[in-house]
């Protein structure tokens, strides 16, 4: 969280980021609000990169003005229109691409004064992993997949039973470029698995975090997975 | 639950002056714009102004510069409206709104008015 | 200031019609205009906001649209708890009301 004020006195106003990360070839939100206005005439919102000589979007008199806006996001921002009057200067970004990290500068002003907030935006790719049984094997094994990471994760794996061990040894990771040839997906295989016990498949980069989970009794086979973007970074 | 509770209904006499008051809760009172509109017997929606409670900050419209005076007090989460000189045509249904976002989301159940000599 | 103009003070209109209310404001607001029911005795409440909107638990049936200087209200089923004044309302400039439709059930 980063928190902005303009400059002293009357005339100033606070702007609040959030530092946040955006998964290639989809759409980002880069997260910033602002002390309320009455009069959405009042309010100008200008995004700015830092080694970005165009604006990455503007927004005044109750509309977007994108005359400066520099060709790497033309056609690829809009703000929340209806929610600007609310204080919500938050930008969405389409099709993020790698080339789009970098440090933001959300820029207000209304009639109550001006402030501004950086955010840091990072971007890279990231999915939710899933652990099958993988019948084809000779021993029992699991099989932990998933889609598009980038940059490349470390991949660890855990078990209930087991707490603290090392499955390094009895596992193998892999990592196969995607047809884009930026992202990979990811591999890795458990091997020696015993039954009634939880496994996790735990992919790490330094944006995103990811667990697959996989419960295997005789009875039946139970999974969960979820993901965290590790952008919470306070400052 | 977001709902501001405006003061009960005032009787004054032409010239005098009246104070209503509008206590928020169940938001940060500090953040939202609180609005002020009145309302004549039969007639339509005015506003009148807003205050921003966090700095202070008012607005009024042209009509009710000198007329009305928005203040708001932090500690009570409370805001208020002082209607000077009144005259028979103050007379009204006085709303307090909170611009929680886009437009008046939560009104006042009103504070009615009466001017009489 | 800038004027709203509801051109009908009053619309009568039976269960299950449809319905709309304009207003029409003197300058371009692009989308800054909010929609309010009042109920006789009560006090006004949000249903549609910039424009199009509908606010948060607002029945489906209610709807707005429009941009600049002209916008409608819709009520696409009347229901006889609609009878009510509708004031449509611009927050592009210092906040006006426009003056009101009075929907009449038959």
């Known amino acids: 969280l980063i928190i902005g004020f303009g400059i002293s006195g009357r005339h100033s106003i606070t702007v609040t980021t959030v530092a946040s990360a955006g998964n290639i070839g989809e759409d980002g939100i880069l997260s910033c609000t602002f002390e309320p206005d009455i009069k959405l005439s009042d309010i100008v919102i200008q995004w700015l990169k830092e080694g970005v000589l165009g604006l990455v979007h503007e927004f005044k008199e109750g509309k977007d003005e994108l005359s400066e806006q520099d060709e790497m996001f033309r056609g690829r921002t809009a703000v929340f229109a209806d929610q600007v009057i609310v204080g919500n200067a938050s930008l969405r970004l389409k099709n993020v691409q790698l080339t789009d990290a970098g440090t933001y500068k959300c820029y207000i002003i209304t009639s109550k004064g001006k402030g501004n907030a950086n955010l840091e935006y990072k971007t890279g790719a990231f999915s939710m992993p899933e652990v099958n049984v993988d019948y084809n094997a000779s021993s029992e094994t699991l099989r932990c997949e998933a889609p598009r990471w980038f940059p490349q994760p470390t991949v660890v794996w855990a078990s209930q039973v087991d707490q603290g061990a090392n499955f390094s040894e009895v596992s193998n990771t892999s990592f196969e470029l995607n047809s884009e040839n930026v992202t990979m997906k990811v591999v890795s295989v458990l091997y020696n698995v015993t039954i009634n016990n939880t496994y996790s498949c735990m992919i790490e980069n330094d944006i995103a975090k990811a667990t697959g989970d996989i419960k295997v009794t005789e009875s039946e086979i139970k999974r969960r997975s979820h993901l965290q973007l590790l952008n919470s970074k306070a400052s | 639950q977001v709902q501001p509770q405006q003061s009960g209904a005032e009787l004054a006499r032409p010239g005098a002056s009246v104070k209503l008051s509008c206590k928020a809760s169940?938001?940060?009172?500090?953040?939202?714009?609180m609005q002020w509109v009145k309302q004549r017997p039969g007639q339509g929606l005015e506003w009148i102004g807003a205050?921003?409670?966090?700095?202070?900050?008012?607005r009024y419209t042209q009509k009710f510069k000198g007329k009305a005076t928005l203040t708001a007090d932090k500690s009570s989460s409370t805001a208020y409206m002082q209607l000077s000189s009144l005259a028979s045509e103050d007379s009204a249904v006085y709303y307090c709104a909170i611009n929680w976002g886009y437009a008046m989301d939560y009104w006042g159940q009103g504070t009615s008015v009466t001017v009489s000599s | 200031d800038i004027v709203l103009t509801q051109s009908h003070k009053i619309m009568s209109t039976s269960v299950g019609d449809r319905v709309s209310i304009t207003c029409k404001a003197s300058?371009?607001?692009?989308?800054?205009v909010a929609w309010y029911q009042q109920k006789p005795g009560q006090s006004p409440k949000l249903l549609i906001k910039s424009a199009s909107y509908r606010y948060t638990g607002v029945p489906d049936r209610f709807s707005g649209s429009g941009s600049g200087t002209d916008f409608t209200f819709t009520i696409s089923s009347v229901q006889a708890e609609d009878l009510a004044v509708y004031y449509c309302q611009q927050h592009y400039s210092n906040p006006t009301f426009g003056g009101g439709t009075k929907l009449e059930i038959k």
């Open positions: 205050i921003y409670p966090g700095d202070g900050d008012t």
């Open positions: 169940g938001y940060t009172f500090t953040t939202y714009w």
């Open positions: 300058q371009d607001v692009r989308t800054a």
